[in-house]
């Protein structure tokens, strides 16, 4: 069970002095800052008992494992249900305290009732201030039963609950009809999930026989010990004023645990501390009684004396709960009450015994929960004791439970039960998470959810290149910190897996599922420079560049050309996806625009240094296309072109440019200038006979305009091969503009 105690200070003369404290003996309880331990919560539960609103209660954290609630201003603030929640994950546990008003009409004879499944529970409300009206019983706030006021027996109203089942658990109240609910008697009924002395799924397992008023937990078979007792079976008393599963906590104040109510995890409930009783836990036990609520009787034999905190104190030569065992009877010594091993380990368990006659190896045996008896493999005999060592076969989960060491000699026998917890090594349920990556390192979060048992003592990260048969590299890391895997290969996929371990031999769990994490490329380092550029039209630019010569392969996937239009605040990016390319044609640019141009090498997603920038001015856009272009063959070497001027001209045309190309030919077209812009016809000479030609033309003002439609025409046959087409007779002087 979780080591969680809710303490209520019941010195009720002044509500402002009242406080509730929740104390956790769990490792790391209340820290809340780390992923392995949620914080302690302490609160009043207003779902069931709602009191008039008042100033909020004050919550104070007192170190890492204690939280205190104060700030009660009036007695009615105290009435109701308080709860403390502690423990992590599946061990998260709620401890409940029910507070009754000392001035209520009805008072519970006993607040907490723990009963077994199938038992009859009897709740008894004692009349404190009589009213001659019905008594209404409620369960968790809903009507449950009515009693006529005449039905009181010896000044008590009884509610009998036959054959109770776990769903019957909860908060019950008895209230006089037409009386304030704050005058109710409040009870807590806890119904164990099994019949008496049984626990586990199907209630097939036998409880260890909890002593001193301890209650067997129906889920795990552990004894929940009353405050002031410890051990697997609550067999050991703490020193006066101490509590907690290992007696590690101390009651505050000079009067020890007087006036304190202790609430522990179900199915224990609440009681006074050891040695105290009464509704406010302020009365010492009567002679012959001891323990929590003074519920236990000493019945000491052989001259033992009764101590109200611990029970019988035996004289020399005697031991046992009632001093009924002679010291000559063999006795198991210093047996740990609880041992923890990991699944599939083969631990050694030692059991020491003393007595007269002296125990020998064969007289000590170990019994497993399934009844199997193990004999010791060796024994160490010392003057005051014999220690038998047992080699335990490979542990399975079913070995969890109560083991027993037993010693038998002619002087008698003794046995000691102890709990063995077989823990399952943790196995990650998910792969580790990649946080960031570089070319030679990966940053990984190893903290993942896991199956099996904690706490996690170490986290190992295993990694190797994907599809590799080489050994895994391993790094041991802090579970709460991110890990950097260093000295990796760039642009490489790595298989990464987590392995978790818990304390103890064999605590390493299986490896978790793998995940693929890929390192980034190396950053390209070469800086290109722009060789040159030339304008191929108002919206076209051809760019060329170079790279420095370096030994070894080129680190890069291609080039990124960037054009920055400062006027419009726009950037154009052109991707050249070959690292061998040294030239590119940029089209669709804005005519008449001043651009800043640079080029950089890229590799994967990484960019190298940019070239020094160049500044390029594109010419403004030209006029519209000439209209109605028409071609007419005149001879075997001449074709006449006619057209109409473009419409909506932005200015005077400086020239026309004619493009001539042999239809179906593979060569570059020829460009011929028509320098007399007022003309609307021209003759192209020097053509080949019987050849089909394609013609188109455009006008120029400051820049070249749009192309006209393309026309086709064939020269007439039987001519000689010409040297090439010319326009009129001036073509030879002007030359050809390609």
């Amino acid at each position: 069970a979780v080591d969680l105690t809710l303490l209520a200070n019941l010195r009720l003369t002044d509500p402002q002095r009242f406080f509730l404290t929740c104390v956790s003996g769990e490792a790391g309880a209340g820290r809340g800052s780390d992923a392995w331990g949620p914080p302690l919560l302490l609160e009043k539960d207003d779902r069931i008992v709602r009191t008039p609103p008042g100033p909020p209660l004050r919550l104070a954290r007192n170190g890492s494992h204690q939280v205190t609630l104060r700030g009660f201003s009036k007695p009615s603030d105290l009435v109701g249900v308080f709860s403390c929640v502690g423990g992590a994950g599946a061990r998260r546990t709620r401890v409940i305290y029910v507070h009754n008003s000392p001035g209520a009409h009805l008072l519970p004879d006993k607040v907490t009732h723990t009963v077994n499944k199938g038992d009859t529970a009897v709740l008894s409300a004692r009349v404190h201030k009589e009213k001659q009206t019905d008594v209404i019983w409620k369960s968790n706030g809903s009507y449950f039963y009515t009693l006529d006021w005449h039905e009181a027996q010896d000044g008590r109203f009884l509610l009998q609950l036959p054959n109770v089942q776990p769903p019957s658990s909860g908060i019950y109240s008895a209230t006089y009809l037409e009386a304030s609910p704050l005058g109710s008697a409040f009870f807590r009924l806890i119904v164990r999930g099994c019949g008496a002395g049984r626990w586990g799924p199907g209630c097939t397992k036998e409880c260890p026989g909890c002593l001193h008023g301890g209650v067997c937990h129906d889920h795990d078979g552990e004894c929940v010990c009353p405050p002031g007792f410890t051990g697997t079976r609550c067999e050991q008393a703490c020193r006066e004023g101490r509590f907690g599963q290992s007696c590690q906590e101390q009651c505050p104040g000079i009067s020890g645990c007087r006036g304190l109510t202790f609430c522990l995890p179900d199915p224990y409930g609440c009681s006074c501390g050891s040695g105290w009783r009464g509704s406010q836990c302020q009365e010492a036990c009567a002679p012959g009684h001891f323990g929590a609520d003074c519920r236990l009787q000493c019945q000491c034999q052989n001259g033992g004396t009764c101590d109200r905190f611990s029970g019988c104190v035996c004289p020399s030569g005697w031991h046992g709960v009632h001093c009924e065992k002679s010291d000559r009877i063999p006795q198991i010594l210093n047996m740990a009450s609880e041992l923890e091993f990991n699944l599939e380990t083969m631990p050694r368990i030692n059991c020491a015994a003393a007595g007269n006659p002296f125990p020998v190896r064969g007289s000590i045996e170990l019994r497993k929960p399934d009844g199997t008896v193990l004999l010791s493999t060796k024994a160490i005999v010392e003057p005051e004791k014999t220690t038998a060592e047992f080699e335990v076969p490979r542990l399975v989960l079913a070995d969890s439970g109560f083991w027993e060491c037993r010693v038998s000699t002619s002087g008698g026998q003794d046995s000691r039960r102890f709990k063995v917890n077989v823990k399952v090594p943790p196995v990650p349920l998910a792969a580790p998470r990649l946080l960031t990556k570089q070319s030679r390192q990966l940053v990984v979060s190893p903290l993942v959810s896991f199956s099996g048992d904690g706490p996690i003592s170490t986290v190992r990260l295993h990694y190797r290149p994907q599809d590799s048969t080489m050994d895994w590299s391993t790094i041991v890391v802090d579970p709460s910190e991110n890990v950097t895997l260093m000295n990796l290969r760039p642009k490489t996929g790595y298989s990464v897996r987590v392995q978790l371990s818990r304390p103890g031999e064999g605590g390493e769990g299986a490896w978790g599922p793998p995940t693929l994490m890929t390192t980034d490329c190396p950053e390209p380092l070469l800086q290109p420079w722009l060789e040159g550029w030339h304008v191929e039209g108002t919206d076209r630019l051809r760019v060329s560049w170079s790279l420095p010569l370096v030994p070894g392969p080129l680190v890069g996937d291609g080039f990124l050309l960037r054009l920055w239009d400062g006027t419009r605040g726009q950037e154009r990016r052109e991707n050249v996806s070959s690292p061998q390319a040294r030239t590119a044609l940029l089209t669709g640019l804005t005519p008449g625009t001043h651009y800043q141009l640079d080029v950089q090498l890229y590799h994967c997603t990484l960019l190298g240094p940019a070239s020094p920038p160049a500044h390029v001015l594109l010419p403004p856009s030209g006029p519209p296309a000439p209209r109605h272009l028409h071609a007419q063959a005149l001879s075997d070497s001449e074709i006449q072109l006619t057209w109409k001027h473009p419409e909506a001209l932005p200015g005077p045309i400086s020239k026309y440019v004619v493009e001539v190309q042999v239809a179906g030919g593979a060569g570059d077209p020829l460009w011929i200038d028509v320098d007399r812009p007022e003309e609307t016809s021209t003759i192209i000479r020097g053509l080949n006979a019987s050849t089909r030609y394609l013609f188109r033309m455009r006008a120029s003002i400051q820049g070249l305009g749009d192309w006209s439609n393309t026309v086709e025409e064939s020269t007439l046959g039987n001519g000689l091969q010409a040297e090439g087409p010319v326009q009129e007779s001036r073509a030879a002087e002007e030359g050809l503009d390609q």
């Epitope: 709602r50 209404i136 706030g141 009507y143 009515t146 006529d148 039905e151 209230t175 037409e178």
Partner: antibody
């Protein structure tokens, strides 16, 4: 769903006897106080008798005390009213009803008649 | 025994009217008063408990008030289905009912 179904009404001569039954379903009958209320033709409602869950405590209106007996069988979820020495003024529709209480710990608990049967007519006449 | 007196014994009203019925106890009964509605040939139905607590499923046009000896049931806007007889009942001691108020169509 809570249901109450009365039966056993009919015509009876003055001085005669009749036993009314009320079959309950849809709730834990053994936990609730039950009662009978009657309504003479064209008149108002009159409480007749109540019985506590245990059956140990019963109460009657002065007009029927000594003549009527209320009882219950928790194993059969049934409420009864044994009516003896009937008089003409006992002629009425007899309703069985359940006693309910306001919910929640924090409310003052008050008593109501929260569910009623459809009634059974008892006519006392010669 | 505590006597409960309702007034008026009957009233005529139209749909949409605001209707008020009063109930007086012969001695103080705190807030332990319930209101029931009964339609001809049917069993009574609980409307309001503890003087002012509306039962679930009861329309919000019904409301109750008062404590001590004087109590009121109000229907803020009378609907056709509200024409019925209304009874008050005290639960302070041995139960007793008012004589009823019949609400009829004008």
């Amino acid at each position: 769903e809570v249901q109450l179904l009365e039966s056993g009404g009919g015509l009876v001569q003055p001085g005669g006897s009749l036993r009314l039954s009320c079959a309950a379903s849809g709730f834990t009958f053994s936990h609730y106080q039950m009662l009978w209320v009657r309504q003479a033709p064209g008149k108002g409602l009159e409480w007749v008798s109540s019985i506590y869950p245990s059956g140990g405590w019963t109460y009657y209106a002065d007009s029927v005390k000594g003549r009527f007996t209320i009882s219950r069988d928790n194993s059969k979820n049934t409420l009864y009213l044994q009516m003896n020495s009937l008089r003409a003024e006992d002629t009425a529709v007899y309703y069985c009803a359940r006693v309910g209480y306001s919910s929640g710990w924090y409310a003052l608990t008050s008593k109501t008649f929260d569910y009623w049967g459809q009634g059974t007519l008892v006519t006392v006449s010669s | 025994d505590i006597q409960m007196t309702q007034s008026p014994s009957s009233l005529s009203a139209s749909v949409g009217d605001r209707v008020t019925i009063t109930c007086r106890a012969s001695q103080t009964i705190s807030s332990y008063l319930n209101w029931y509605q009964q339609k001809p040939g049917k069993a009574p139905k609980l409307l309001i408990s503890a003087a002012s607590t509306l039962q679930s499923g009861v329309p919000s046009r019904f409301s109750g008030s008062g404590s001590g000896t004087d109590f009121t049931l109000t229907i803020s806007s009378l609907q056709p289905e509200d024409f019925a007889t209304y009874y008050c009942q005290q639960s302070y001691s041995t139960p007793s009912f008012g004589q009823g108020t019949k609400v009829e169509i004008k």
